[in-house]
């Protein structure tokens, strides 16, 4: 056969579906690889072919579209399972071709088991809600296209294992779940179970997502430098190790670029001919506010180093701040024993 543009195994779309539930999987060619859609391809005389490789096998085989009750079917660019079985797990390939053109892509499909509390190996999407921000909603994801708009499904929401009924600040509203005022206590996994009829059968769709309550943009402030500060003086003798921590608090801001850096005498530490090392650590609060600490270290400080200006800088999407560390040379204590002995002048 002629050469085929092979996009390989598209691991970006590691599709996971629950066992014994319907699944509709669109051929990724049209969504991510080709510049035309299925309708255009079909009207140009191109045919979409599906095949698969079972888990732990090397052999590509055609998909059996003649199973009882049309358990697996194809409709336009969608492969349908009504419902899935555990042994449907494998790598699926969709190939678009005619006599002069060929393009194909493979993707992994994993059929996953869940327990009665919806726990499973499924990778969960994370939805961030702002703390105490007013009404915010999450929507039951990935249920479009499973049933026509004329069908009215029943939707049940759960937090963890518990059906959401008479919760203080969480209200189910069909496909949406409304949080009247999000609090840390609302962190957790939320599941919607969508039940709908089709051809005399009842199907269930289970969708779980993780809700994470984060700092609100209303409360976001420019970076706050906790250290260095005016209360701590770094007093050292030449030859000692100088350690200055720069500790900066950053409010949570979605996708903000948070930066901490040191300057010495207004220059990059690299531009100063001293042996400086800087180590950074990062920690997060429950609302994903961030604390970055950069420790500036000079192993054997000289009297010249103790006269330099050490400034910690920080920047986020909210602004930029800087703070100088108070560094000074320790004054040696007077040697009283010698002075007193001389003072008494023994005869």
């Amino acid at each position: 056969s002629e050469r085929c543009d092979d996009w390989g195994l598209d691991t970006m779309r590691q599709i996971q579906v629950f066992e014994d539930e319907p699944a509709r999987i669109k051929c990724p060619l049209f969504e991510h690889f080709l510049k035309f859609n299925y309708s255009t391809a079909h009207s140009a005389g191109l045919t979409l072919i599906w095949y698969w490789t079972r888990q732990d096998r090397d052999l590509e085989e055609p998909i059996n579209f003649r199973l009882p009750e049309n358990r697996i079917s194809k409709e336009k660019d969608v492969l349908w399972f009504r419902p899935t079985l555990l042994n449907d797990t494998g790598n699926y390939t969709c190939m678009l071709r005619n006599t002069t053109y060929c393009s194909k892509v493979a993707f992994p499909l994993e059929v996953v088991q869940k327990d009665s509390c919806f726990n499973s190996p499924m990778k969960l999407p994370v939805h961030k809600l702002y703390i105490e921000y007013g009404i915010q909603r999450i929507t039951c994801p990935n249920v479009d296209g499973y049933f026509p708009s004329s069908v009215k499904p029943t939707i049940t929401w759960y937090m963890g294992c518990y059906k959401i009924q008479n919760f203080n600040n969480v209200i189910p509203e069909g496909m949406n779940l409304s949080f009247l005022i999000a609090l840390i206590s609302n962190n957790g996994n939320y599941t919607c179970v969508v039940t709908y009829p089709e051809n005399g059968r009842t199907f269930h769709l289970t969708r779980t997502l993780t809700v994470k309550v984060v700092g609100s943009p209303k409360n976001a402030v420019p970076p706050v430098i906790h250290s260095p500060n005016d209360h701590v003086v770094y007093e050292k003798e030449p030859g000692e190790e100088l350690l200055i921590p720069c500790t900066v608090y950053f409010s949570f801001l979605m996708d903000s670029r948070n930066e901490v850096w040191w300057t010495i005498d207004g220059k990059k530490p690299d531009d100063i001919t001293i042996d400086v090392t800087i180590n950074e650590s990062i920690s997060h609060s429950r609302t994903e506010d961030e604390t970055r600490t950069q420790i500036l270290s000079i192993k054997k400080v000289t009297s010249e180093d103790l006269k330099r200006s050490y400034v910690c800088h920080a920047r986020s999407a909210k602004g930029e701040v800087a703070k100088a560390a108070k560094v000074k040379q320790k004054v040696p204590a007077p040697r009283y024993t010698v002075e007193l002995a001389c003072g008494f002048g023994a005869t």
Partner: antibody
């Protein structure tokens, strides 16, 4: 003198892979964030990815997530971009750039670019 | 993602003219903005960072101003060497979006 030189571009088929390299000299490489920026023919600039000084943080534009991997070798003072599942829309001049030290995020030194063409 | 909108997209001017290019961010980026100049077939060159800081070696006829969402690049007296494309770029948030560019051409 700061020098930034890209290499590794070329013609590749859709779905193929390519690894771009960026050799640098004249500055303390390990102290700077590094970045890749691309420019499709006749189009504007698009930030692609960047990597922190020690490689502990990497960020990507959405359109390349899962397909491109940025990496660095501080001993060799080099930056890399591994590109896979390439598409026609990845065709562009790829620039390697150093991010400014003071607060990072802007690009103060650029290479002359290496051209990547994705076509069957 | 933050959108950066530059205007105008093309600007016709003469040598000696005062030229102003504006850049608007879809949300506040504080002062996390840079401006670049690019000539055909060449790599971009940094002109301004932190909204108003002039990069060393850049002529003083270039200046930047603004904060939050509105920014401007001003060329006080356009020189023959200044006919080029100009881009703004925000770096307060990932990803580091560029404006679509402004081409300054000879009138």
């Amino acid at each position: 003198e700061v020098q930034v030189v890209e290499s590794g571009g070329g013609l590749v088929q859709p779905g193929g892979s390519l690894r771009l390299s960026c050799a640098t000299s004249g500055f303390t490489f390990r102290s700077y964030w590094m970045t890749w920026v691309r420019q499709a023919p006749g189009k504007g600039l698009e930030w692609v990815a960047n990597i922190k000084q020690d490689g502990s943080e990497r960020h990507y534009v959405d359109s390349v997530k899962g397909r491109f991997t940025i990496s660095r070798d501080n001993a060799k003072t080099s930056l890399y971009l591994q590109m896979s599942s390439l598409r026609a829309e990845d065709t562009a001049m790829y620039y390697c750039a150093r991010e400014g030290y003071y607060g990072s995020g802007y690009f103060d030194y650029w290479g002359q670019g290496t051209l990547v063409t994705v076509s069957s | 993602d933050i959108q950066m909108t530059q205007s105008p997209s093309t600007l016709s001017a003469s040598v000696g003219d005062r030229v102003i290019i504006t850049c608007r961010a879809s949300q506040s980026i504080s002062r996390g903005l840079a401006w670049y100049q690019q000539k055909p077939g060449k790599a971009p060159k940094l002109l301004i960072y932190k909204a108003s800081n002039l990069e060393s070696g850049v002529p003083s006829r270039f200046s930047g101003s603004g904060s939050g969402t509105e920014f401007t690049l001003t060329i006080s007296s356009l020189q023959p060497d200044d006919f080029a494309a100009y881009y703004c770029q925000q770096y307060s948030y990932y990803s580091h979006t560029f404006g679509q560019g402004t081409k300054v051409e000879i009138k």
